[in-house]
C-alpha cells in the first residue's frame, strides 16, 4: 500500500537564532531496514535539496550545513529534520519525501519570528506645548519579524487611528525596524500609548508618553445632562438639568447659553451677552441666574403640559461649544376606575354581560389588564379605547364581555407605564337572580 507520511498541520514557529525541528514520521513495516529507505527533505517551492538519506547512509546537509537528521530514530520511522541557527530566509515550506517500496510526501511550514524591542518614544516639538498644538509622536521598535501591527491609543484605551503613518524597513538579516508616527492635536493633557504587536508570537511591546501642556486659553466645553428622561407630572414644574465646568476666570459675559427643542430647533430660552434673554416658550421657562456662574445651566419649565414632552437641547458656548439633549417625559396619573355592568339586573349564571371599566385624565396611554377573582388574566373579548382630550390627557374605556358563572369577581387594572402607577376597580357578582348594583 501507499506510504503515509505524517507532519504537523500547523506551521513550526522558530525564533531567529534558535534551532527548529521539522517533524516528519512514517510507519515502518515489520522487517523494515534502513537500507530500503530513501528520505529526501527539499524546499517545496524551488525543489532545492536540503538533506537526504539514501542507500543506508545519511547523505548530509545540502543547506548551508545547518541541517541534521536524527539517525538513531530513523529506524522507528522518525524522519524529522533539525534546522540550526534559524534565519529569516529559512521561512517557508519544506517537503519530507519518504520512499521504501512505495512512497509518500508531505510539506511542513516553518514560520520564523523575532520579538520586537520595547518601543522608544520621541516627541516633536517637545517643549512649550499648549492645548491645540499639533505634535508628532514617534514610536520606534527594532529587530522584529514578521512585520508588526502597530496600535495607538489614548489614556482611556480608546484607539487612535487617524493621522498615523507607519513604516517598516528590513535590515540585511531580514529583521524589521518599525517607526510609527502619530500626529495629534493636544487636549488639556493626554497619554498616548504605542503597542507593537508581533502577529506570530502574539507578543506585545508597549510604551507610552504623557503630555501635560500649559493651560490653554480655550478648552472644549463639556455639557452634562441626565441620561434618563426627566419625568414631570402635568401641571407641576420640571427642572431640565444641564451643567458645564467653567474655567478659572470665567465670567458670564463670555457665556452663550441656548435651550432649544431638539427636533424643531425652536428656541426655548437663552442667555447671551451677559444677560438672560428670557423665555421664548410661552413664558413658562426660567434659568437659575444665581447658579450660572458655577456652571449650572439648568432650565425650569413651569406648569408642564403634555405638549412639552420631548427632547430639549442645552447648548453652551464660551469660546468653544458643546451641547447635549435631555428628554422630558410627561405623565399624569389615572383616576380610580369606575365600573358599569350591562345588563345590570335579573342576572343569571350563563348570561353574557358587558363590564365597562373607565379611568380618566391620564398620560401617557394606559395599559389595561382584566382578571378574575383568582387573579387569572382575562384576555378574550376585551375591547379597550383611549381618547385624548384637548389637553392631550387620555380617558380609557375598557369593555369585557363574559358569560357569568355561579358568582364571580372581575377586576380591572389601569396602569400608567411611566409612573408605574396602578389604578384598580372591581365588581363582584353573586347569587341568583342577581342585580347590579346590589339593592339595599
Amino acid at each position: 500500500g501507499a506510504l503515509e507520511v505524517q507532519v504537523p498541520e500547523d506551521p513550526v514557529v522558530a525564533l531567529v537564532g534558535t534551532d527548529a525541528t521539522l517533524c516528519c514520521s512514517f510507519s515502518p513495516e515489520p522487517g523494515f531496514s534502513l537500507a530500503q529507505l530513501n528520505l529526501i527533505w527539499q524546499l517545496t517551492d524551488t525543489k532545492q535539496l536540503v538533506h537526504s538519506f539514501a542507500e543506508g547512509q545519511d547523505q548530509g546537509s545540502a543547506y548551508a550545513n545547518r541541517t541534521a537528521l536524527f539517525p538513531d530514530l530513523l529506524a522507528q520511522g522518525n524522519a524529522s529534520l533539525r534546522l540550526q541557527r534559524v534565519r529569516v530566509a529559512d521561512e517557508g515550506s519544506f517537503t519530507c519525501f519518504v520512499s521504501i517500496r512505495d512512497f509518500g510526501s508531505a510539506a511542513v511550514s516553518l514560520q520564523v519570528a523575532a520579538p520586537y524591542s520595547k518601543p522608544s518614544m520621541t516627541l516633536e516639538p517637545n517643549k512649550d506645548l499648549r492645548p491645540g498644538d499639533t505634535v508628532t509622536i514617534t514610536c520606534s521598535s527594532y529587530q522584529g519579524y514578521p512585520e508588526a501591527e502597530v496600535f495607538w491609543q489614548d489614556g482611556q484605551g480608546v484607539p487612535l487611528t487617524g493621522n498615523v503613518t507607519t513604516s517598516q524597513m528590513a535590515n540585511e538579516q531580514g529583521l524589521f525596524d518599525v517607526h510609527s508616527i502619530l500626529r495629534v492635536v493636544l487636549g488639556a493633557n493626554g497619554t498616548y500609548s504605542c503597542l507593537v504587536r508581533n502577529p506570530v508570537l502574539q507578543q506585545d511591546a508597549h510604551s507610552s508618553v504623557t503630555i501635560t501642556p500649559q493651560r490653554s486659553p480655550t478648552g472644549a466645553v463639556e455639557v452634562q445632562v441626565p441620561e434618563d428622561p426627566v419625568v414631570a407630572l402635568v401641571g407641576t414644574d420640571a427642572t431640565l438639568r444641564c451643567s458645564f465646568s467653567p474655567e478659572p476666570g470665567f465670567s458670564l459675559a463670555q457665556l452663550n447659553l441656548i435651550w432649544q427643542l431638539t427636533d424643531t430647533k425652536q428656541l426655548v430660552h437663552s442667555f447671551t451677552e451677559g444677560r438672560d434673554q428670557g423665555s421664548a416658550y410661552a413664558n413658562r421657562t426660567a434659568l437659575f441666574p444665581d447658579l450660572l456662574a458655577q456652571g449650572n445651566a439648568s432650565l425650569r419649565l413651569q406648569r408642564v403640559r403634555v405638549a412639552d414632552e420631548g427632547s430639549f437641547t442645552c447648548f453652551v458656548s464660551i469660546r468653544d461649544f458643546g451641547s447635549a439633549a435631555v428628554s422630558l417625559q410627561v405623565a399624569a396619573p389615572y383616576s380610580k376606575p369606575s365600573m358599569t355592568l350591562e345588563p345590570n339586573k335579573d342576572l343569571r349564571p350563563g348570561d353574557t354581560v358587558t363590564i365597562t371599566c373607565s379611568s380618566y385624565r391620564g398620560y401617557p396611554e394606559a395599559e389595561v389588564f382584566w382578571q378574575d377573582g383568582q387573579g387569572v388574566p382575562l384576555t378574550g373579548n376585551v375591547t379597550t379605547s383611549q381618547m385624548a382630550n384637548e389637553q392631550g390627557l387620555f380617558d380609557v374605556h375598557s369593555v369585557l364581555r363574559v358569560v357569568l358563572g355561579a358568582n364571580g369577581t372581575y377586576s380591572c387594572l389601569v396602569r400608567n407605564p411611566v409612573l408605574q402607577q396602578d389604578a384598580h376597580g372591581s365588581v363582584t357578582i353573586t347569587g341568583q337572580p342577581m342585580t347590579f348594583p346590589p339593592e339595599a
Partner: antibody
C-alpha cells in the same frame, strides 16, 4: 427651499490665501448656523469652524490663526478664508448648516468647492 | 478632543442584507451623534440625528441606536442606492467626524 451655493474651484500656490463664498437662500443667516467642513481627496470629513445664528465664530483649534469666517447678512453670504496654504490643504470645502442657534448636525450642504494647492 | 472610532472601515454586502456600522467615542457624549451618507462627488446627506431620530425624508430602513460611547447605524434591508460611504459626527463637545465606512457591493 433651503439652498447653499458655493463659489467655483480655485488653484492656489503654497503660502497664498483662498476665500470661498457660500450664498444661502430659503433661510435667514440670523436663524441658521453655518459651518465649513473640508474633505481631502479620498479622505474623511474635517470640521473647520462655524458661525452661529447670533454671529459668533468658532474655529477648530487645528486651523486657529489660519482661518477666518465672516458673513454678510445683507447678501445672505458666508465666507471662509484660509491663509498660509500648503499642499495638504488641497480638498473639497463644503459649507453646511441647519436651523437654530445651537451648532449641532447639518441638514443642508453646499455643492462643495475644490481648492487645489500646488506649486 | 473627543476621538471617534468608526468600524468597519469598509464593508461588502448584498442587496437585501442587514448591515450594521458602529461608532465609538473616547468619552460619553450622551446622544449627541449624527450619521451621514456620502456618495462619490456629492455632499454628505443627513440620515440620523440625536443618535436615533430619523431625518425627514430618509427611508425607515435606516435606524440609529446607542448612547454614551457606543452607537450603531443599521440598514435593515440594503437597497442598490445605499452603497456609499457613511460617517458619524459628534456635537457633544465641539464637532468631530468619524473616519468613515465604505459600503460596497459584494
Amino acid at each position: 427651499q433651503v439652498q447653499l451655493v458655493q463659489s467655483g474651484a480655485e488653484v492656489k500656490k503654497p503660502g497664498a490665501s483662498v476665500k470661498v463664498s457660500c450664498k444661502v437662500s430659503g433661510f435667514s443667516l440670523t436663524s441658521y448656523h453655518v459651518s465649513w467642513v473640508r474633505q481631502a481627496p479620498g479622505q474623511g470629513l474635517e470640521w473647520m469652524g462655524a458661525i452661529s445664528s447670533g454671529g459668533s465664530s468658532y474655529y477648530n483649534s487645528k486651523f486657529q490663526g489660519r482661518v477666518t469666517m465672516t458673513r454678510d447678512t445683507s447678501t445672505s453670504t458666508v465666507y471662509m478664508e484660509l491663509s498660509s496654504l500648503r499642499s495638504e490643504d488641497t480638498a473639497v470645502y463644503f459649507c453646511t448648516g441647519d436651523l437654530g442657534a445651537a451648532i449641532s448636525w447639518f441638514a443642508y450642504w453646499g455643492q462643495g468647492t475644490l481648492v487645489t494647492v500646488s506649486s | 478632543d473627543i476621538q471617534m472610532t468608526q468600524s468597519p472601515s469598509s464593508l461588502s454586502a448584498s442587496v437585501g442584507d442587514r448591515v450594521t456600522i458602529t461608532c465609538r467615542t473616547s468619552q460619553s457624549i450622551y446622544k449627541s451623534l449624527a450619521w451621514y451618507q456620502q456618495k462619490p462627488g456629492k455632499a454628505p446627506k443627513l440620515l440620523i440625528y440625536n443618535a436615533h431620530s430619523l431625518q425627514t425624508g430618509i427611508p425607515s430602513r435606516f435606524s440609529g441606536s446607542g448612547s454614551g460611547t457606543d452607537f450603531t447605524l443599521t440598514i435593515s434591508s440594503l437597497q442598490p442606492e445605499d452603497f456609499a460611504t457613511y460617517f458619524c459626527q459628534q456635537y457633544y463637545s465641539g464637532l468631530t467626524f468619524g473616519s468613515g465606512t465604505k459600503l460596497e457591493i459584494k
